[in-house]
């Protein structure tokens, strides 16, 4: 979490930011909030980027306002126009690019004054695992996948059973690139299971922690998925 | 130590060409916008063009468009300035300022100049 | 383009006197004006951002102030090391554009 103060002639307002992660080609928010007016009219709302030339976004006047947009950011975004009035200056990106991490400055200007503050973003791809039992195999063998991720994860086996258990050796990961040439699926083979036992497949990476969870016993497999965006802080 | 050190200046006839080099150092350097601003003998400032960061965007004045060519090498932490069709009035000292964030930050840090004298 | 009037050009003032620098844009450009120091022989340094806020570092002798055309520059008590000249620059819009400079000067 950020906090920015204005610090100006006129007043300082409060600004608020939570760092967060896009997940690319999907669309992605960037949250912002401050100290809200009465009129719509006397709020300014600009999102800059670090070494960008024109703006991310700018919305005044109780519209946008994008003469001054970036050409990396056409048509690409939106604010959230009838929660302004209340507060929120938050960002909707579009189609998430590699190239849009980096820092982004939410810049308030109301009737009460002004103020900022930084928000981190980062940008990857992150999707949940799935682990299922591999009949094909020749012994008792786990298989788990999830279809994009970037830059390249670490998976990790556990077992409830087997707490602390390093399954390095008796696992096998491999990484398939995409047709974007961008994202890549993961694949990883657990073998010699036991039953009556819970495995679970961890995947991570600097932006998103994932994990496939999967129980089994003699009558029924039971299956369960998480996935967990690292490093969201408020500013 | 933040810094930024021009080179490149120096004489050239009225006509030719010249190019300008501000090596960067102490910061990351693709997270800044970098701009070129000159200050004729005696004179005020005087802008002269803009780069992005990941150098995909420029910004010219009108009194250089067409002549001039901004341009960076992030691997080498360095920015250029080409100067084609030099003329008289384009003496001038020649400085490059970073600028991290457009319109609310400001050009916090330039760097000491370089000479760049055109005449016959 | 964004047309920057300060004034006066030039001024003398004496030691712990308030000095004040106008600077008058063309059009509105909200907060997004930058003030700066040159002196002599020196490459310019950033003393004001966004019209009213400290670059890290500089005295708090200085300040600024004012929004949309009309913006302030105050040395509140005039030091010897001030003498210089004072630019103002806007950041609302390409082409950048600076006033055409206050030289301060002591009595």
């Known amino acids: 979490l950020i906090i920015g103060f204005g610090i100006s002639g006129r007043h300082s307002i409060t600004v608020t930011t939570v760092a967060s992660a896009g997940n690319i080609g999907e669309d992605g928010i960037l949250s912002c909030t401050f100290e809200p007016d009465i009129k719509l009219s006397d709020i300014v709302i600009q999102w800059l980027k670090e070494g960008v030339l024109g703006l991310v976004h700018e919305f005044k006047e109780g519209k946008d306002e994008l003469s001054e947009q970036d050409e990396m950011f056409r048509g690409r975004t939106a604010v959230f126009a009838d929660q302004v009035i209340v507060g929120n200056a938050s960002l909707r990106l579009k189609n998430v690019q590699l190239t849009d991490a980096g820092t982004y400055k939410c810049y308030i200007i109301t009737s009460k004054g002004k103020g900022n503050a930084n928000l981190e973003y980062k940008t990857g791809a992150f999707s949940m695992p799935e682990v299922n039992v591999d009949y094909n195999a020749s012994s008792e063998t786990l298989r788990c996948e999830a279809p994009r991720w970037f830059p390249q994860p670490t998976v990790v086996w556990a077992s409830q059973v087997d707490q602390g258990a390093n399954f390095s050796e008796v696992s096998n990961t491999s990484f398939e690139l995409n047709s974007e040439n961008v994202t890549m699926k993961v694949v990883s083979v657990l073998y010699n299971v036991t039953i009556n036992n819970t495995y679970s497949c961890m995947i991570e990476n600097d932006i998103a922690k994932a994990t496939g969870d999967i129980k089994v016993t003699e009558s029924e497999i039971k299956r369960r998925s998480h996935l967990q965006l690292l490093n969201s802080k408020a500013s | 130590e933040v810094q930024l050190v021009e080179s490149g200046g120096g004489l050239v006839q009225p006509g030719g060409s010249l190019r300008l080099s501000c090596a960067a150092s102490?910061?990351?350097?693709?997270?800044?916008?970098m701009h070129w601003v000159r200050q004729a003998p005696g004179k005020g400032l005087e802008w002269v063009s803009a780069?992005?960061?990941?150098?995909?965007?420029?910004r010219y004045a009108d009194s250089v468009k067409g002549r001039f060519t901004i341009s960076r090498d992030n691997s080498k932490n360095t920015l250029y300035l080409q100067m084609n069709s030099l003329r008289a009035e384009d003496t001038a000292v020649y400085y490059c300022?970073?600028?991290?964030?457009?319109?609310?930050?400001?050009?916090?840090?330039w760097g000491q100049g370089t000479l760049v004298t055109v005449s016959s | 383009d964004i047309q920057m009037t300060q004034s006066p050009s030039s001024l003398s003032a004496s030691v712990g006197d308030r000095v004040t620098i106008t600077c008058q844009a063309s059009?509105?450009?909200?907060?997004?004006l930058n003030w700066y120091q040159q002196k002599p022989g020196k490459a310019p340094k950033l003393l004001i951002y966004?019209?009213?806020n400290l670059e890290t570092g500089v005295p708090s002798r200085f300040s600024g102030s004012g929004s949309g055309t009309d913006f302030t520059f105050t040395i509140s008590s005039l030091q010897p090391e001030d003498i210089a000249t004072y630019y103002c620059?806007?950041?609302?819009?390409?082409?950048?554009?600076f006033g055409q400079g206050t030289k301060v000067e002591i009595k």
């Open positions: 300022a970073r600028d991290r964030f457009r319109k609310v930050h400001g050009f916090d840090v």
């Open positions: 102490g910061f990351t350097f693709n997270s800044y916008a």
């Open positions: 780069i992005s960061g990941n150098g995909g965007s420029t």
């Open positions: 059009q509105d450009i909200s907060n997004y």
């Open positions: 966004d019209a009213s």
């Open positions: 620059q806007q950041d609302a819009t390409f082409p950048l554009t």
